[in-house]
Interface confidence: medium
């Protein structure tokens, strides 16, 4: 889970060990943040839990880019 | 393309364990999200438990909370699901079901697993 | 928990006839962000695993004869065999997957008359 040590930066310390379903996901944002330890990717899904994930692994990526064509996609 | 493989039936004691294997192949076990569902004699279908990638753990049903554990092998790629202090209410198929990346729902099941629990 | 509720636990129809299954879930299982119902049917033959029908309440799994249809959205969700085949007898069940734990319907038994 992300962690706010002195809001407003939210750092990860951990990534998810695993891939999650990217019909869960509902958003993410970047966490480049220089205070933090590493960059990171903090999902947030449809059930409001937030996951630190590695901007490095594919299916991160693949995640992100499935995301933001649905934002792009104007709802009918 | 997923599959499973499930281990064979099994008959046991009340008051014992059993403990039954889904072999993955097509996929690793890290890349799905392995399940346990069972289903009783002309019963439904009862949802045992499984891993949760958003919480990033096993989580169970709570009818089944410190009789159950369920446990993955990632060597082999085989999931494991332990029940003890067994009744005869336990009788039941048990199945392995998974999900693939794109999809949140169950989408591959094996055959099952019958497990009798008799005296 | 999310508890679903299907009717009738069973049904008679003639072959060609039309059948309905009606699930019903205690909570919404639409996220409304993406317009999406997180439920799923599937058709289960003795001795068999369940097969999944149809996905996001109303998307056909590919395979699946054009006869099945899901329908619905929120709480409320039909599924319809326009016209009802021997194959078609089975049980059938309704689960949802927006948020553990994962839940079925008691499930439905489809019969020939």
């Known amino acids: 889970q992300p962690d706010a040590i002195n809001a407003p930066v939210t750092c990860c310390y951990n990534f998810t060990n695993r891939k999650i379903s990217v019909q869960r996901l509902a958003s993410y944002r970047r966490i480049t943040s220089s205070k933090c330890p590493k960059e990171a990717v903090i999902f947030k899904t449809i059930v409001a839990k937030e996951i630190c994930a590695d901007p490095k692994q594919k299916w991160v990526q693949d995640s992100m880019d499935h995301l933001d064509k649905q934002t792009q996609t104007p709802k009918t | 393309q997923v599959q499973l493989v499930q281990s064979g039936a099994e008959v046991k004691k009340p008051g014992a364990s059993v403990k039954v294997s889904c072999k993955v192949s097509g996929y690793t076990l890290t890349e799905l999200s392995m399940h346990w569902v069972r289903q009783a004699p002309g019963k439904g279908l009862e949802w045992m438990g499984g891993?949760?990638?958003?919480?990033?753990?096993?989580i169970y049903a709570q009818k089944f909370q410190g009789r159950v554990t369920m446990t993955e092998d990632t060597s082999t790629d085989t999931a494991y699901m332990e029940l003890s202090s067994l009744r005869s209410e336990d009788t039941a198929v048990y199945f392995c079901?998974?999900?693939?990346?794109?999809?949140?729902?169950?989408?591959?099941w094996d055959q099952g697993t019958l497990v009798t629990v008799s005296s | 928990d999310i508890v679903m509720t299907q009717s009738p636990d069973s049904l008679a129809a003639s072959l060609g006839e039309r059948a309905t299954i009606n699930c019903k879930s205690s909570?919404?299982?639409?996220?409304?962000?993406?317009?999406?119902?997180?439920l799923v049917w599937y058709q289960q033959k003795p001795g068999q695993p369940p097969k999944l029908l149809i996905y996001w309440a109303s998307i056909r799994e590919s395979g699946v004869p054009d006869r099945f249809s899901g329908s619905g959205s929120g709480t409320d969700f039909t599924l319809t065999i326009s016209s009802l085949q021997a194959e078609d007898v089975a049980v059938y069940f309704c689960q949802q997957y927006y948020s553990s734990p994962w839940t079925f319907g008691q499930g439905t038994k489809v019969e020939i008359k």
């Open positions: 909570q919404s299982v639409l996220y409304r962000s993406n317009n999406k119902n997180y």
């Open positions: 891993f949760d990638p958003e919480d990033d753990e096993t």
């Open positions: 079901a998974t999900n693939d990346f794109w999809s949140g729902y169950f989408d591959c």
